[in-house]
């Protein structure tokens, strides 16, 4: 609340978050030309990244292109890539949509499709839908502590969420543990009013705020966080624009001496945590 | 434009990021001791990291030092590091210029030169120029879609950069698209009065600035934002404080069971998304 | 100082690190059942990870799981997981505290204890104390550069914590130099009243503040930052609410055709960089 | 699925020459060939992209073989000279994305090296 008499300060915050949990993911693997049903367990290392501060990302879907190797072949016959003769391929053209550089020729895709054929990591990535239901669905379930020390430097005033009375095993709930900072990921989405396993396929953005209002006067002190949720990203986004959240990032290794790369498409929720607030003294 | 009689508050952001552009590379690459001249493509997961919110790296540069493996060597003979006899290299000493921890002998680095033995990856990364021109000179023409999602919680006010109808398509340019999103690297760097083929060699930080003035009021209301670059880092700076950006990372493997790594130096653009302004209503 | 007069604008930062140093880490390695001792060298590469903007993490610590498959195994037999019979195994069960799903059976894990089978990356991570001392305590010696360009946009003015006539070979010291912009890390700690060695061994968080307080009126110019140390870690925080700082990465690797992992828990210290101030004008 | 057909295999000497082709039931973009030597596993000899470009040779048979195709038929041959008992494996015609990925195989044809 506004106390005019009170000289405010913006809060300087430093935030910490710690994710646990585990997926089992199901999903169809191909070798030697056989599909079959593969299992396998996602933890922490596998789902998240190592990153700073106010943002962490946990994987909840992923479309892999395995053994790309450097060298020529036909694109990916997307929506208009097609051809039918070497003139519809310019040498030395990169489509923004393409994932190579034309060499000027028109070869076969498959029986029926003939594309340009570019340099590139080969074979190009098949631009699929992210599978549905997402492959880390379950993800819902996972945890995260929030860790959150701020400070009014003017005011020579240092807090954390986090008291010395709390319960390391609670989970955060709006009406009955407000100030538990352990939440459930499908809790935030449930406060911000948003369907996890929907959004899960395509990936988001959440918004996690923390809202300090800090009377650090002695004789009224207060000074305790409060959360909120909001999805950032846009659920109505047109194509274009690149609905959802999600990035491509590569493992590379040789294989008879030849440099090779697994490119994986992570479709996902990064939590954004957005501290906010002011501290007020007479 | 200041109305005195408005309450003024912070904007609280979020940024979201996405590059587009595919670079071909081509460099000496050396064989069994034969030199050719070989030919690479470089699409996003092999050009930038998956990086949170305000920042994006894009890799313009690199200088490879492979096959490395923990033994003992000479080190760089740099200037000043040449010895000629045991009595210049102290046992357990590590200088800060160098890549490894003394072993108190002086070897020979070449048929002329001799250096002091150390402790380190093997061979030690020689200390050579960035390349020029940068070896993804052409990252000039790629692109980068920019989302920002802002919101003034005590007006409870929520907004976004792309609306629904904008064009996908689009490029920004001061006077003729101000409002679109999508920012060609080399544009920014123009409009920053900078030279993008001569920071691509050492690298840089460059600024996006987003800034939002915010009126609220319903009888006047206007909210969107105004887009500024600016470089962030110093040109002119000493060699002693380390101009540029670049920063070293390795792929670790195993081969005939002993671990080797490749330590890429990558030299690049860091952007760096500022968002600032306020909203005031009445 | 306020000067009721002057119109205060909140600052606009962006900051670039760049750590140096070598640390020689001595440590027990098990091969082919022989353990004897390894010495090995860590490089900013091997310690430190491509981060961006306002923190950086520098690893003091680490316990590594070697050759992780994804596979059927007892879970670690950490207080209260063991079993006597599969009566006590719930199959499908995730328990936030193991590393896997179990199976439904109760299994041995050694000649004397009987755990939970799980489907898991196995062997399943040991929950063994991380080691005392720091493996890389000696990163006590490490410097790391800061560079921070500020700006006031309202005030259209830019400046930087680097000035042309600084020394390279400078270090920070509060008295003898307040404004050389390299800083030992163990220095870091002393000012802010903390042990490194202590804190190297679970990790932790540390604030570097630097506080801009600028007068830009051209009679009384002043805008130069100062320099100021806390821990933003809880010491005293209980063990359910994980203290320290550490996260999980694995580097996946195939063998034989089996997809293999190494886990490694790095312990190390954050370091936050938390920039504010004001510049105010007449 | 893409049926493939092996012809020219049999018995031939150190240092003697010999010519497989392979008939391919559909146009591809890349085909190839690969061997299985007995209680080896089958490793990759040649490749030819489309019209013969990009070529791709293991390092063990560059200057011995030449592999060619006719995209009209869509056959792919090859010459093998300079052979050596170590040569003796059962050679697969292939077909596939590029030079370095393939999907199938056919049932494969006897080379033997031998004297």
């Known amino acids: 609340s506004d106390k005019l008499y009170q000289r405010k300060e913006p809060v300087i915050s430093s935030v910490h978050t710690k994710v646990k949990g585990i997926a089992e993911v199901t999903e169809n693997v191909t070798e030697g030309g056989v599909t079959k049903l593969g299992h396998s367990i996602f933890d922490t290392a596998d789902y998240t990244f190592p990153l700073q501060g106010n943002s962490f990302f946990v994987m909840t879907n992923y479309v892999k292109s395995e053994g790309q190797v450097q060298t020529l072949c036909p694109e990916y016959p997307r929506r208009g890539a097609q051809c039918s003769s070497d003139r519809r391929c310019k040498k030395g053209w990169m489509d923004p949509q393409s994932k190579g550089i034309q060499t000027g020729r028109c070869v076969p895709y498959d029986k029926t499709r003939k594309t340009c054929e570019v340099s590139a990591w080969c074979p190009t990535e098949e631009e699929k839908e992210a599978p549905r239901p997402a492959l880390l669905r379950s993800a819902e379930n996972f945890t995260v502590l929030i860790k959150n020390n701020i400070h009014f430097p003017g005011h020579n005033y240092t807090t954390r969420n986090i008291l010395p009375t709390m319960n390391g095993s609670c989970t955060f709930h709006k009406t009955w543990d407000p100030q538990c900072s352990i939440f459930r990921l499908g809790d935030i989405f449930q406060e911000a009013g948003e369907n996890f396993t929907e959004v899960a396929v395509q990936g988001g953005i959440m918004g996690i705020e923390i809202y300090w209002d800090c009377n650090l006067d002695s004789w009224s002190h207060h000074c305790r966080p409060r959360y909120s949720f909001r999805r950032l990203d846009d659920k109505n986004m047109d194509e274009s624009f690149v609905p959802g959240y999600n990035f491509r990032y590569a493992k590379y290794y040789k294989e008879n001496n030849v440099e090779k790369r697994t490119l994986i498409k992570a479709f996902g929720i990064r939590f954004d945590i957005l501290v906010f607030g002011t501290g007020g003294k007479f | 434009s200041d109305k005195l009689y408005q309450r003024k508050e912070p904007v609280i952001s979020s940024v979201h990021t996405k590059v587009k552009g595919i670079a071909e590379v081509t460099e000496n690459v050396t064989e069994g001791g034969v030199t050719k001249l070989g030919h690479s493509i470089f699409d996003t997961a092999d050009y930038t990291f998956p990086l949170q919110g305000n920042s994006f790296f894009v890799m313009t540069n690199y200088v490879k030092s492979e096959g490395q493996v923990q033994t003992l060597c000479p080190e760089y003979p740099r200037r000043g590091a040449q010895c000629s006899s045991d009595r210049r290299c102290k046992k357990g000493w590590m200088d800060p210029q160098s890549k490894g921890i003394q072993t108190g002998r002086c070897v020979p680095y070449d048929k002329t030169r001799k250096t002091c033995e150390v402790s380190a990856w093997c061979p030690t990364e020689e200390e050579k120029e960035a390349p020029r021109p940068a070896l993804l000179r052409s990252a000039e023409n790629f692109t980068v879609l920019i989302k920002n999602n802002i919101h003034f919680p005590g007006h409870n006010y929520t907004t976004r950069n792309i609306l629904p109808t904008m064009n996908g398509s689009c490029t920004f340019h001061k006077t003729w698209d101000p409002q679109c999103s999508i920012f060609r690297l080399g544009d920014i760097f123009q409009e920053a009065g900078e030279n993008f083929t001569e920071v691509a060699v050492q690298g840089g930080i460059m600024g996006i600035e987003i800034y939002w003035d915010c009126n609220l009021d319903s009888w006047s209301h206007h909210c969107r934002p105004r887009y500024s670059f600016r470089r962030l880092d110093d040109k002119n700076m000493d060699e002693s404080f380390v101009p540029g950006y670049n920063f070293r990372y390795a792929k670790y493997y195993k081969e005939n069971n002993v671990e080797k790594r490749t330590l890429i130096k990558a030299f690049g653009i860091r952007f760096d998304i500022l968002v600032f302004g306020t909203g005031g209503k009445f | 100082s306020d000067k009721l007069y002057q119109r205060k604008e909140p600052v606009i930062s962006s900051v670039h690190t760049k750590v140096k140093g070598i640390a020689e880490v001595t440590e027990n390695v098990t091969e082919g059942g022989v353990t004897k001792l390894g010495h090995s060298i860590f490089d900013t590469a091997d310690y430190t990870f491509p981060l961006q903007g306002n923190s950086f993490f520098v690893m003091t610590n680490y316990v590594k799981s070697e050759g992780q498959v994804q596979t059927l195994c007892p879970e670690y037999p950490r207080r209260g997981a063991q079993c006597s019979s599969d009566r006590r195994c719930k199959k499908g069960w995730m328990d936030p505290q193991s590393k896997g799903i179990q199976t439904g059976r109760c299994v041995p894990y050694d000649k004397t204890r009987k755990t939970c089978e799980v489907s898991a990356w196995c062997p399943t991570e040991e929950e063994k104390e991380a080691p005392r001392p720091a493996l890389l305590r000696s990163a006590e010696n490490f410097t790391v550069l800061i560079k921070n360009n500020i700006h006031f946009p309202g005030h259209n003015y830019t400046t930087r914590n680097i000035l042309p006539t600084m020394n390279g070979s400078c270090t920070f010291h509060k008295t003898w130099d307040p404004q050389c912009s390299i800083f030992r890390l163990g220095d870091i700690f002393q000012e802010a009243g903390e042990n490194f060695t202590e804190v190297a061994v679970q990790g932790g968080i540390m604030g570097i503040e630097i506080y801009w307080d600028c007068n830009l009126d051209s009679w009384s110019h002043h805008c130069r930052p100062r320099y100021s140390f806390r821990r933003l870690d809880d010491k005293n925080m209980d063990e359910s609410f994980v203290p320290g700082y550490n996260f999980r990465y694995a580097k996946y690797y195939k063998e034989n055709n089996v997809e293999k992992r190494t886990l490694i828990k790095a312990f190390g210290i954050r370091f936050d960089i938390l920039v504010f101030g004001t510049g105010g004008k007449f | 699925e893409v049926q493939l057909v092996e012809s020219g295999g049999g018995l031939v000497q150190p240092g003697g020459s010999l010519r497989l082709s392979c008939a391919a039931s559909e146009r591809t973009y890349s085909m190839g060939w690969f061997r299985q030597a007995p209680g080896k596993e089958r490793e990759f000899v040649a490749g030819?992209?489309?019209?013969?470009?990009?070529?791709r040779y293991a390092d063990s048979v560059k200057g011995r073989f030449t592999i060619s195709r006719d995209n009209a038929k869509n056959t792919v041959s090859l010459q093998m000279s300079g052979l050596k008992p170590e040569d003796t494996a059962i050679y697969y015609c292939?077909?596939?994305?590029?030079?370095?990925?393939?999907?199938?195989w056919g049932q494969g044809t006897q080379v033997t090296v031998s004297s």
């Open positions: 292939a077909t596939g994305t590029s030079v370095y990925h393939y999907q199938y």
């Open positions: 030819s992209g489309w019209d013969g470009i990009p070529t």
